[in-house]
Amino acid sequence: YDFTNCDFQKIEADYLRTISKDLITYMSGTKSTDFNNTVSCSNRPHCLTEIQSLTFNPTPRCASLAKEMFARKTKATLALWCPGYSETQINATQAMKKARKSKVTTNKCLEQVSQLLGLWRRFIRTLLKKQ
C-alpha cells in the first residue's frame, strides 16, 4: 500500500492521543535503553510502511502483535485516514488473527514494540520538519 495520500496530521493526532499510550503500556516494566533501535524511516509514507509491517507482519520470534490494543487502534487510524488502505490491507491482516495462539509477551515482542515506538517518534519528527 502507498501511504502517500494519508492525512498525516490526523494520524499524528490519533497516535499522540491514544496509540502512544497503549504502546507505552505494553512496554511497561522495560527501560528505553533495554533495546537498540535498528529500524528507521526517512519520510512520512516510509514511516507508515515500516509501522504497518512491524505491527501486522508476524516474525519468527514474535508471532503476531495484531490483536494488541495498539495494533487495533493503528489499523483503525490507517483505515480512517488513508484512502484505499482498508481495501488492500484489512483482508491480509485477518489471517494473522487466526495465527495467534496465546497472548505471551516475549522479549522479542517487547523489542519489536520498542522499534515501533521509535518509528512513530520518527514519523512525528518528519511531520514537524515539513511544517
Epitope: T18, K75, A76, A79
Partner: antibody, heavy 120, light 111 residues
Framework: QVQLVQSGAEVKKPGSSVKVSCKAS????????ISWVRQAPGQGLEWLGV????????NYAEKFQGRVTITADTSTSTAYMELSSLRSEDTAVYYC?????????????WGQGTLVTVSS | QSALTQPPSASGSPGQSVTISCTGS?????????VSWYQQHPGKAPKLMIY???KRPSGVPDRFSGSKSGNTASLTVSGLQAEDEADYYC???????????FGGGTKLTVL
C-alpha cells in the same frame, strides 16, 4: 441479536439542544464506526459525523462543525449525538448507522430513527 | 442541493429492468471505489443494498447490481418486483475531510 436501538422522539424549542442515544448490541462496539445521518421530512439523507469508539475521537461534516457533538461510551456500547442551537430546519429523523469494521463509510446496520421536532 | 446527483424518479413494469444513475466528481465517485446504495421504504430506516460499487451484502437479491464509470455510479434492478418500489440513495466516500456524501434520492415506482 445485532441491532442499534435509539432513544425516543423529542420536541424542542428553537435555540435549545437535543441529545439522542444509540445503544448497540450483538457486536463488538469498539472497532466499528458509528455515524449519524439525518433526514428532514420528504428530503434526502445527510451525514453529520462519525466516531470510532476504539479511537474515541469524532469527525464531523463541515456544515455541522461547532454545533454537533458525537460521543461514545464503550462500557455501555452506546453512542450519543448532541445538536445545539436548534432551528426549525433541524426538524428531521436522526439515524445512527454502523460503518462496517474498518470500512467506516458504508452503513450495514441502522437504528430505527429518532424524530426530532423543533418548534416554538 | 446534494453533492451527488440522482434523477428524482424512475419507473418500470414488473419483470423489467431499471437503472438509476448517480453523478459525482473526481473528488468522490471518480476518486474512490467506495460507492454504496441504500433502499428506503416509507417510514423505515435505509437498508444497504450495494457497497464498494458492486458488492451485495448477504440477503440482498442478485437482481440488484452496481457499476461505475468515471464519475458516475449506477444501480440496476432487474426483474422488477412490487416490493422494489422504494426510495434509493447513492453514497460515496469523499476523502478524509468530507468523508461521506449522499445523493438526493430516486423514487422507484413499479407500474
Amino acid at each position: 441479536q445485532v441491532q442499534l436501538v435509539q432513544s425516543g422522539a423529542e420536541v424542542k424549542k428553537p435555540g435549545s439542544s437535543v441529545k439522542v442515544s444509540c445503544k448497540a448490541s450483538g457486536f463488538t462496539f469498539g472497532s466499528y464506526g458509528i455515524s449519524w445521518v439525518r433526514q428532514a421530512p420528504g428530503q434526502g439523507l445527510e451525514w453529520l459525523g462519525v466516531i470510532i469508539p476504539l479511537l474515541g475521537v469524532p469527525n464531523y461534516a463541515e456544515k455541522f462543525q461547532g454545533r454537533v457533538t458525537i460521543t461514545a461510551d464503550t462500557s455501555t456500547s452506546t453512542a450519543y449525538m448532541e445538536l445545539s442551537s436548534l432551528r426549525s430546519e433541524d426538524t428531521a429523523v436522526y439515524y445512527c448507522a454502523r460503518g462496517a469494521e474498518y470500512f467506516y463509510w458504508y452503513f450495514d446496520l441502522w437504528g430505527q430513527g429518532t424524530l426530532v421536532t423543533v418548534s416554538s | 442541493q446534494s453533492a451527488l446527483t440522482q434523477p428524482p424518479s424512475a419507473s418500470g413494469s414488473p419483470g423489467q429492468s431499471v437503472t438509476i444513475s448517480c453523478t459525482g466528481s473526481n473528488s468522490d465517485i471518480g476518486g474512490y471505489n467506495r460507492v454504496s446504495w441504500y433502499q428506503q421504504h416509507p417510514g423505515k430506516a435505509p437498508k444497504l443494498m450495494i457497497y464498494e460499487i458492486s458488492k451485495r451484502p448477504s440477503g440482498v437479491p442478485d437482481r440488484f447490481s452496481g457499476s461505475k464509470s468515471g464519475n458516475t455510479a449506477s444501480l440496476t434492478v432487474s426483474g422488477l418486483q412490487a416490493e422494489d418500489e422504494a426510495d434509493y440513495y447513492c453514497s460515496s466516500y469523499a476523502g478524509t475531510d468530507t468523508f461521506v456524501l449522499f445523493g438526493g434520492g430516486t423514487k422507484l415506482t413499479v407500474l
